[in-house]
């Protein structure tokens, strides 16, 4: 799995999307877990409704919410009031029995509030910004910014 970076600003909300094959994962509940370090286990943060048919209902654990569009094949996680210690590696998972398939590996990056740090360089709208593959950054939005190109709007 590549690791997709989602960037959010401290104090704001961040929405993470995990697309998946709706037919392959039909009937399966989903979960959002936080990985301990680069190679540690993934600790469950929140999971979708116990009844798969009600997966569209938003479920909260603290400031983290999860909702699943089972027809469209998109799992959405919302991190409300993003804080520095929310930064880290996460996974979107598809559950079957006691097993879990990884739908997407996510790096949540927390940026300083530009109102607190007006010296921020090249600050753009946060959102899904880049992917890492085998520890190498692919040429994507943030690399474009780094090379002085015009930033794209955030993906939705």
């Amino acid at each position: 799995h590549n690791t997709t970076v989602f960037q959010g600003v401290a104090g704001q909300s961040l929405q993470v999307s995990c697309p998946y094959d709706s037919m392959k994962h039909w009937g399966r509940r989903k979960a959002w877990c936080r990985q301990l370090g680069e190679k540690g286990p993934c600790q469950r943060v929140v999971s979708t409704h116990n009844l798969w048919l009600l997966s569209f209902l938003r479920r909260w654990n603290g400031s983290t919410a999860i909702t699943d569009d089972t027809l469209g094949g998109t799992l959405t996680i919302t991190l409300r009031n993003l804080q520095p210690h929310d930064a880290g590696l996460y996974q979107c998972q598809s559950l079957h029995g006691s097993e879990a398939d990884t739908l997407r590996k996510v790096l949540v990056e927390v940026l300083a509030d530009p109102l607190d740090h007006r010296d921020a360089g090249d600050l753009w709208f946060p959102g899904e910004s880049e992917s890492f593959e085998d520890a190498h950054v692919e040429h994507s939005i943030s690399r474009s910014l780094l090379e002085g190109e015009i930033p794209f709007p955030p993906t939705s």
Epitope: Q7, L107, E109, S142
Partner: antibody, heavy 120, light 106 residues
């Protein structure tokens, strides 16, 4: 084992430039925010600049803004600090510091530092 | 940016003593405070982050506490290898270090 090795320090005249490098190993460099922190001789620690994982967001202390540029090469696992228009008050040991995964708010590992002396 | 004042700047203690170091912010820090240890000629080492979270590999005799503007690093029983300078560091608004507390043997 996490390693951060700084290089590029030395004696430089006021107004001149210097570029510091920090070679990182033992971790997935592109997952971590990075920073430079300095320490003048016999003085305390002073944050200088930070950079996001992809390099698109940079932050500087007021006294170096417009003179210093932090950057990173994720393919080379290297952090840089370009220092222009150097002043005597920039004399310090410069430490490369690794943030945590996805952030450079606090620093979990530090290099051994490289000494920059600005003097005529 | 928030200013941090550490006290005392120099503290003399004996091995086995319970040692308390103080750090005060010019405004609220919201628990976004870390403590670093720096021995002579060495790079700083992270001890505590987010006020009271112990960094991996740091002995449990180190602990942090506090809220608002006032924070404390406590060494429950001083070891000789703990003699060093300790810096508090806030990352709530900007990034600033305190002036340091040098811990020496009495």
């Amino acid at each position: 084992e996490v390693q951060l090795v700084e290089s590029g320090g030395g004696l430089v005249q006021p107004g001149k430039s210097l570029k510091l490098s920090c070679a990182a190993s033992g971790f997935t460099f592109s997952y971590y925010g990075m920073a430079w922190v300095r320490q003048a001789p016999t003085k305390g620690l002073e944050w200088v600049a930070s950079i996001s994982t992809g390099g698109g967001n940079t932050y500087y202390r007021d006294s170096v803004k417009g003179r210093f540029t932090i950057s990173r090469g994720n393919a080379k696992n290297t952090l840089y600090l370009q220092m222009d228009s150097l002043r005597s008050e920039d004399t310090a040991t410069y430490y490369c510091a690794r943030g945590d995964i996805g952030t450079s708010y606090w620093f979990t590992y530090w290099g051994q530092g490289t000494l920059v002396t600005v003097s005529s | 940016d928030i200013q941090l004042t550490q006290s005392p700047s120099l503290l003399s203690a004996s091995v086995g003593d319970r040692v308390t170091l103080s750090c005060k912010g010019s405004q609220t820090i919201n628990n976004y405070l870390a403590w670093y240890q720096q021995k002579l000629g060495e790079a700083p080492k992270l001890l505590i982050y987010k006020t009271n979270s112990l960094q991996t590999g740091i002995p449990s005799r180190f602990s942090g506490s506090g809220s608002g503007t006032d924070y404390t690093l406590t060494i429950s029983s001083l070891h000789s290898e703990d003699l060093a300078t300790y810096y508090c560091y806030q990352y709530n608004n900007g990034w600033t270090f305190g002036g340091g507390t040098k811990l020496e043997l009495k």
